[in-house]
């Protein structure tokens, strides 16, 4: 191009032939002349080629397709004029600049300038005749090549050629494969499988951090956050691609023989051009193992005869428990109980053991002790189980001294009440005060039924009737009845019988 200059200003150099473009046939001569009082040089540029010529007349006697390009004349004042020369060669339609890179969301230039501008349908095609992606848009420029607009990740490794029709015949360039660099649009994804670790001194600490990103350019590292002396940790890296834009790296941190002062917080940190991400994991190293049984809300358990009860023990243990056992009354081994890891704790040191006692009998009250041990320590917790039973009237007798006696057993301790009623009454409602109440020791065990003995003086009764002995506690009640009649001045007969009232 040869711009005109304003009067008084230096003019740009003048080129002959005086046109912006020139078409020359291959084998012919290119003759370009630059006229300028302060001529400096000619430059020639095409693709990555740049040549200088200090002669004001540039002559190329046997023009080749590769001589196609932009010829620029430069003057001493820095002004320049250019002409673009096409060297038309029947065998070479495209000049090719490889390789081809693109950045996601940017344009990419497929460098395939033409040696002949008088062609049609200058475009891109897929190497093997398949369709190009439907969203791929391109803009042709005979002097530079074809620009792919707004490169997508999906175009990565797309094989393409430039193509054009010359005199009705399709011509194709060499192959290009587009290598796409993903735009970093998010921070890396960083994860560790466990957020806390508990070890004994001498154990090996290993934790794997997984970093996921779209490209290999992500940086990652393990950092110990605590100010304690830096642990003698080793980091091993493994990485792989799960497809073109799914890159995964594993950073494995290992402390081969952990010490108490290795305890602390370790951070796996990763960053890319978008930002950074991190995840932490806590290491606690203890000198020796432990078992901590969590306080049980109530170790004294009351249960009604025939019902079920669960004895639940929750504890932390490291190393893991080796033996778990339930013992009844300090001797009889019971079933082992159901044990499981409490999964809400990621370090997996929290355990639960559950003893299910079904349809308990009154005789099955007592101490139930849970014993647990690991390689270092043992611990235990004892439950006192009391079985609440409805009172049972064991004996109801008329004694030699004229007293009526009632003996009842149950848990909790039954209360014995006496009532009198005449034969005409449906229920006995008149209370009779006892003359003697004794609580007996039913068994050696404090968990057995409690036996209560109560008696009344029968001489207080002056009428025919019935005496009721009623034993009751929180669970229920039972009754026994004494029927008697007067014959003259003496009680003829006293016949006891029982009636259990639920």
């Amino acid at each position: 191009s040869q711009p005109s200059a304003s009067p008084g200003e230096p003019s740009p150099p003048s080129i002959q032939p005086a046109q912006s473009e020139l078409i020359v046939e291959a084998g012919d001569t290119i003759r370009l002349t630059c006229t300028d009082p302060a001529f400096v040089k000619w430059t020639f540029e095409i693709l990555d080629v740049r040549i200088e010529n200090k002669q004001s007349e540039w002559i190329r006697e046997k023009a080749e397709a590769t001589h196609t390009g932009k010829y620029t004349c430069v003057s001493g004042s820095g002004l320049r004029s250019s002409i673009y020369v096409f060297v038309r060669d029947p065998a070479v339609l495209f000049l090719v600049g490889l390789p081809l890179f693109g950045k996601e969301d940017n344009d990419a230039l497929v460098r395939c300038p033409l040696t002949d501008p008088q062609v049609s349908n200058y475009s891109l095609i897929e190497c093997d005749g398949k369709s190009l992606p439907t969203d791929l848009k391109f803009v042709p420029n005979p002097k530079a090549g074809i620009t792919i607009k707004n490169v997508k990740r999906a175009y990565h490794r797309l094989c393409i050629r430039c193509a054009a029709q010359r005199e009705g015949k399709w011509m194709r360039s060499d192959k290009f494969t587009l290598k796409v660099r993903a735009a970093i649009k998010a921070i890396p994804v960083v994860s560790v499988p466990e957020t806390s670790h508990l070890l004994k001194e001498g154990d090996t600490f290993t934790v794997i951090c997984t970093i996921k990103d779209v490209s290999t350019s992500v940086d990652s590292m393990w950092i110990k956050l605590n100010p304690q002396p830096q642990s003698k940790a080793q980091v091993k890296r493994n990485s792989w691609h799960q497809g073109d834009f799914n890159y995964e790296r594993q950073e494995t941190l290992t402390i081969s023989s952990a010490r108490v002062n290795d305890s602390g917080v370790f951070m796996c940190y990763a960053n890319n051009t978008f930002g950074s991400a991190n995840v932490t994991t806590t290491l606690k190293v203890v000198e020796k193992g432990f078992i901590n049984i969590f306080p049980v809300k109530n170790t004294t358990v009351f249960v009604t005869d025939g019902e079920n009860v669960d004895l639940v023990v929750e504890f932390e243990a490291y190393p893991k428990p080796e033996h778990q056992q339930w013992i009844y009354m300090n001797r009889t081994p019971t079933n082992r109980g159901e044990d499981y890891v409490k999964s809400d704790n990621q370090s997996n040191i929290r355990y639960v053991n559950e003893l299910r006692l079904t349809r308990l009998k009154g005789t099955e009250g007592g101490t139930y002790t849970f014993l647990v041990s690991n390689s270092d320590v043992s611990a235990s917790v004892t439950f006192d189980v009391y079985v609440n039973t409805k009172p049972e009237i064991l004996t109801y007798d008329r004694l030699m001294n004229g007293r009526l006696q009632c003996v009842a057993a149950g848990f909790p301790e039954p209360t014995i009440d006496w009532y009198f009623c005449t034969g005409a009454e449906q229920r006995c409602t008149v209370p009779v005060p006892p003359v003697d109440v004794q609580i007996q020791n039913a068994s050696v065990s404090p968990f057995g039924k409690l036996v209560v003995q109560s008696s009344i003086d029968s001489s207080v009764f002056r009428h025919n009737g019935t005496v009721e002995c009623k034993a009751s506690n929180a669970v229920g009640k039972s009754s026994a009845f004494f029927n008697f009649a007067f014959k003259g001045n003496s009680k003829e007969q006293i016949q006891p019988h029982t009636l259990f009232t639920p």
Partner: antibody, heavy 118, light 111 residues
Framework: QVQLVESGGGVVQPGRSLRLSCAAS????????MHWVRQAPGKGLEWVAV????????DYTDSVRGRFTISRDNSKNTLYLQMNSLRAEDTAVYYC???????????WGQGTTVTVSS | DIVMTQSPLSLPVTPGEPASISCRSS???????????LDWYLQKPGQSPQLLIY???NRASGVPDRFSGSGSGTDFTLKISRVEAEDVGVYYC????????FGQGTRLEIK
């Protein structure tokens, strides 16, 4: 003519550093992805690192990640490999190679020898 | 990483006879673009490696037509139709689908 020439190799103690260079000529260096490949004595080829044409993307084999850094100066047509915390197992002939349009290595340098020994 | 396994590791051949080297990958090297990212290299004694075959079956510039590559997915073969004395050296396959890995190499020697 088109060529790659490595330099900077030598004998170094474990834990020390070394910087290798690869001078490119005869082609437009700034257009090409470049790689380092090494070969331990009597062993096969092992890929080490890659850098994109413009220096934006880099990748390394896992055994050197964090110790080696690949870089380039397109104005000087030169590729570099900064090797820190060297180990005995890093002893090898180091080649630079050019990646072509098909992601193959169409051009290799003559190699430079790195020996890590105490 | 993708593991590349070559066989045989040693290949004695009489000049003029054909030779064949196998290369197997631990996962498919066929990209969705239809190309297998598998290349073959020859390292002659005392020299740098040189590219023979790219994208599974394409001969590199200047490589004699007695060399040919075939295969797809995980199984690939390099064939030399008539071995010449200058073909002696170690042949490597290389995958470029993911992080680059090489096969162990096959040493071709003249009987």
């Amino acid at each position: 003519q088109v060529q790659l020439v490595e330099s900077g190799g030598g004998v170094v103690q474990p834990g020390r550093s070394l910087r290798l260079s690869c001078a490119a000529s005869g082609f437009t260096f700034s257009r090409y992805g470049m790689h380092w490949v090494r070969q331990a004595p009597g062993k096969g080829l092992e890929w080490v690192a890659v850098i994109w044409y413009d220096g934006t993307n880099k990748d390394y084999t896992d055994s050197v990640r964090g110790r080696f850094t690949i870089s380039r100066d397109n104005s000087k047509n030169t590729l570099y490999l900064q090797m820190n915390s060297l180990r005995a197992e890093d002893t090898a002939v180091y080649y630079c190679a050019r990646e072509d349009w098909a992601e193959a290595f169409d051009m290799w340098g003559q190699g430079t020898t790195v020996t890590v020994s105490s | 990483d993708i593991v590349m396994t070559q066989s045989p590791l040693s290949l004695p051949v009489t000049p003029g006879e054909p030779a064949s080297i196998s290369c197997r990958s631990s996962q498919s090297l066929l990209h969705s673009n239809g190309y297998n990212y598998l290349d073959w290299y020859l390292q002659k004694p005392g020299q740098s490696p040189q590219l023979l075959i790219y994208l599974g079956s394409n001969r590199a510039s200047g490589v004699p037509d007695r060399f040919s590559g075939s295969g797809s997915g995980t199984d690939f073969t390099l064939k030399i139709s008539r071995v010449e004395a200058e073909d002696v050296g170690v042949y490597y396959c290389m995958q470029a689908l993911q992080t680059i890995t090489f096969g162990q190499g096959t040493r071709l020697e003249i009987k």
